[in-house]
């Protein structure tokens, strides 16, 4: 058993039917010695008397808010949450596995640049009685500071019969140098509590591996005289790290017909312009990627050919 | 990424082309190592990230773009002195900091070259003959060093009398390749920045 925060305790349990459970001793936070009784949640049934209460915690019915009283007056509370260990693995019932880039990916994180600012998000099908708290650091043995905001509900979507809720959080490394070569990963830890169930999720990454630039901006077409060709030009996104000559991007230019089945023409370039043939009803799209470290491509910026 | 490779302009900062080749070569070698050593801890998540140049060179600091020198988090005051007569330098225009930067890069390359050659000698003794260092990568390191053209004492290749532990050697190869790829990215950024300056 360990303290999550004041008066909230997590009991770690080997979780299988008929498992022996854990013996827990609760102590009433009071100088009083006599006449103390204990109750659980809203029930008035007296579970025991005395300054301490010993309980065998085996299932969720044994968790909840234990209150010690004296003569009708509340003396203190202890909220017991359960953390399930199924066959030696901590349970992951609260969050959905996003399965990208691999199984057991519960937290996903992205950064728009090398400033040390990043966003993480996660999914759940649970809509009520749910709280999250997020901590982060650079490295774990001698952690360096990363400050995270509060997790907020950022999207809701319907998936088949289920509603899915997306939560996200923004974090900023306290003293980040965009040019630094990372040797210690960023660690992100999310505590999730649903009713009386506690779970924790972690993700470990280097900023360089979660980079996803914003799409190129100011995408423009300039028709070339007496030709079906056009000059496409664009700019680096505002959110990208500077100087651009040091933090360079590479680009992919795509000409896509109206039908998804039509052949796509693709050109790769390090410049911020390209000459392509603009077909009728087609659209031109450009996306960006770090030129030297192949992390994710940005989303496409698009403009119609007409 | 299989992209069309642009040939550098003749007037281009001469080391840029070599540094691009270096990054391509080390990335290919790392990919090959990951595939060949699939049952070894060779991914970025599995390995310890060690920098063999730590406390010996200060490439990131010495090569910091001017725009980032205002960022206090970037100013790790590690002072290292270097010899300064490189041929990549645009002669009189070169500041002392630029010379320091390029000579730091040269020292990095020299250190990695020694490590890779020592490691290759061990890998050649492996009866499994599972993986060897790409000669192209070693050649590209050499070409960039020659382009930088710094006079520096030659570091003798380390020789070991004891029987090599091939498992450990292969894990060390992965560690080294990951670190060298990160340094190659920095070198490429620096060359691109200097070329634009």
């Amino acid at each position: 058993i360990w303290e999550l925060k004041k008066d909230v305790y997590v009991v770690e349990l080997d979780w299988y039917p008929d498992a022996p459970g854990e013996m827990v001793v609760l102590t009433c936070d009071t100088p009083e010695e006599d006449g103390i009784t204990w109750t659980l949640d809203q029930s008035s049934e007296v579970l025991g008397s005395g300054k301490t209460l010993t309980i065998q915690v085996k299932e969720f019915g044994d968790a909840g808010q234990y209150t010690c009283h004296k003569g009708g007056e509340v003396l203190s509370h202890s909220l017991l949450l359960l953390h399930k260990k199924e066959d030696g693995i901590w349970s992951t019932d609260i969050l959905k596995d996003q399965k990208e880039p691999k199984n057991k990916t519960f937290l996903r994180c992205e950064a728009k640049n090398y400033s040390g600012r990043f966003t993480c998000w996660w999914l759940t099908t649970i809509s009520t009685d749910l709280t999250f708290s997020v901590k982060s650091s650079r490295g774990s043995s001698d952690p360096q500071g990363v400050t995270c905001g509060a997790a907020t509900l950022s999207a809701e979507r319907v998936r088949g019969d289920n509603k899915e809720y997306e939560y996200s959080v923004e974090c900023q490394e306290d003293s980040a140098c965009p040019a630094a070569e990372e040797s210690l990963p960023i660690e992100v830890m999310v505590d999730a509590v649903h009713k009386l169930k506690y779970e924790n999720y972690t993700s470990s990454f280097f900023i360089r591996d979660i980079i996803k630039p914003d799409p190129p901006k100011n995408l423009q077409l300039k028709p070339l005289k007496n030709s079906r060709q056009v000059e496409v030009s664009w700019e680096y996104p505002d959110t990208w790290s500077t100087p651009h000559s040091y933090f360079s991007l590479t680009f992919c230019v795509q000409v896509q017909g109206k039908s998804k089945r039509e052949k796509k023409d693709r050109v790769f370039t390090d410049k911020t312009s390209a000459t392509v043939i603009c077909r009728k009803n087609a659209s031109i799209s450009v996306r960006a990627q770090d030129r030297y470290y192949s992390s994710s491509w940005s989303e496409w910026a698009s403009v119609p050919c007409s | 990424r299989n992209l069309p490779v642009a040939t550098p302009d003749p007037g281009m900062f001469p080391c840029l082309h070599h540094s691009q080749n270096l990054l391509r070569a080390v990335s290919n070698m790392l990919q090959k190592a990951r595939q060949t050593l699939e049952f070894y801890p060779c991914t970025s998540e599995e390995i310890d990230h060690e920098d063999i140049t730590k406390d010996k060179t200060s490439t990131v600091e010495a090569c910091l773009p001017l725009e980032l020198t205002k960022n206090e988090s970037c100013l790790n005051s590690r002072e290292t002195s270097f010899i300064t007569n490189g041929s990549c330098l645009a002669s009189r225009k070169t500041s002392f900091m630029m010379a320091l930067c390029l000579s730091s890069i040269y020292e990095d390359l020299k250190m990695y070259q020694v490590e890779f050659k020592t490691m290759n000698a061990k890998l050649l003794m492996d009866p499994k003959r599972q993986i060897f260092l790409d000669q192209n990568m070693l050649a590209v390191i050499d070409e960039l060093m020659q382009a930088l053209n710094f006079n520096s004492e030659t570091v003798p290749q380390k020789s070991s009398l004891e029987e090599p532990d091939f498992y450990k050697t292969k894990i060390k190869l992965c560690i080294l390749l990951h670190a060298f790829r990160i340094r190659a990215v920095t070198i490429d950024r620096v060359m691109s920045y200097l070329n634009a300056s």
Epitope: Y16, D18, D87, D93 | -
Partner: antibody, heavy 112, light 107 residues
Framework: EVKLVESGGGLVQPGGSLRLSCAAS????????MVWVRQAPGKGLEWVAS????????YYADTVKGRFTISRDDSKNTLYLQMNSLKTEDTAVYYC?????WGQGTTVTVSS | DIVMTQSPSSLSASVGDRVTITCKAS??????VAWYQQKPEKAPKSLIY???HRYSGVPSRFSGSGSGTDFTLTISSLQPEDFATYYC?????????FGGGTKVEIK
């Protein structure tokens, strides 16, 4: 007493469908993840699918992905395995399990 | 997928013998390994989880050890009811995979 009882097995033609059920009792079913495991005649054990408490996370073996669907009804204390597009190689005894408890198994035979 | 290689595939032993079965994972699985016992025409029985933890009710003569890639199930003193097939399983990552089984027969 913890009990898991499978049902729904039988003989089916290739391409056909079957729905297996597993009735659970003696424990708070909704609080536990569950799995289906199968064993072809004379062969070893093969994991088929898993479902977490609350159905938030579901995983399948590649051999059944897209054809089989694991689900649960916590109000009925029942685990299901919907098997479509059955193949002869799906012939096996199917067990539902929640360690350390296993059902007795139900036999599925796919044959023309 | 993680391959669990069990050895031997079969062994002959006498009552009272110490029996050791090994299981090798093709990659690191931590301690996320379980062991099962199965008798002919019966459902498997869970013995060990987390490489070395016995489920309640499992006799103390069964013990598991190992971590990473190498795991062992030991029966300290073989009893008549222990003649069966034993399977290891990794549950570190999906797909969950079983070893091929070890049949323990009477000598």
């Amino acid at each position: 007493e913890v009990k898991l009882v499978e049902s729904g097995g039988g003989l089916v033609q290739p391409g056909g469908s079957l729905r297996l059920s597993c009735a659970a009792s003696g424990f708070t079913f909704s609080d536990y993840g569950m799995v289906w495991v199968r064993q072809a005649p004379g062969k070893g054990l093969e994991w088929v699918a898993s479902i977490s408490s609350g159905s938030s996370n579901i995983y399948y073996a590649d051999t059944v992905k897209g054809r089989f669907t694991i689900s649960r009804d916590d109000s009925k204390n029942t685990l299901y395995l919907q098997m479509n597009s059955l193949k002869t190689e799906d012939t096996a005894v199917y067990y539902c399990a929640r360690n350390p408890y296993w059902g007795q198994g139900t036999t599925v035979t796919v044959s023309s | 997928d993680i391959v669990m290689t069990q050895s031997p595939s079969s062994l002959s032993a006498s009552v009272g013998d110490r029996v050791t079965i090994t299981c090798k994972a093709s990659q690191n699985v931590g301690t996320n390994v379980a062991w099962y016992q199965q008798k002919p025409e019966k459902a498997p029985k869970s013995l060990i989880y987390s490489a070395s933890h016995r489920y309640s009710g499992v006799p103390s003569r069964f013990s598991g050890s190992g971590s990473g890639t190498d795991f062992t199930l030991t029966i300290s003193s073989l009893q008549p009811e222990d003649f069966a097939t034993y399977y290891c399983q990794q549950y570190n990552s999906y797909p969950l995979t079983f070893g091929g089984g070890t049949k323990v027969e009477i000598k």
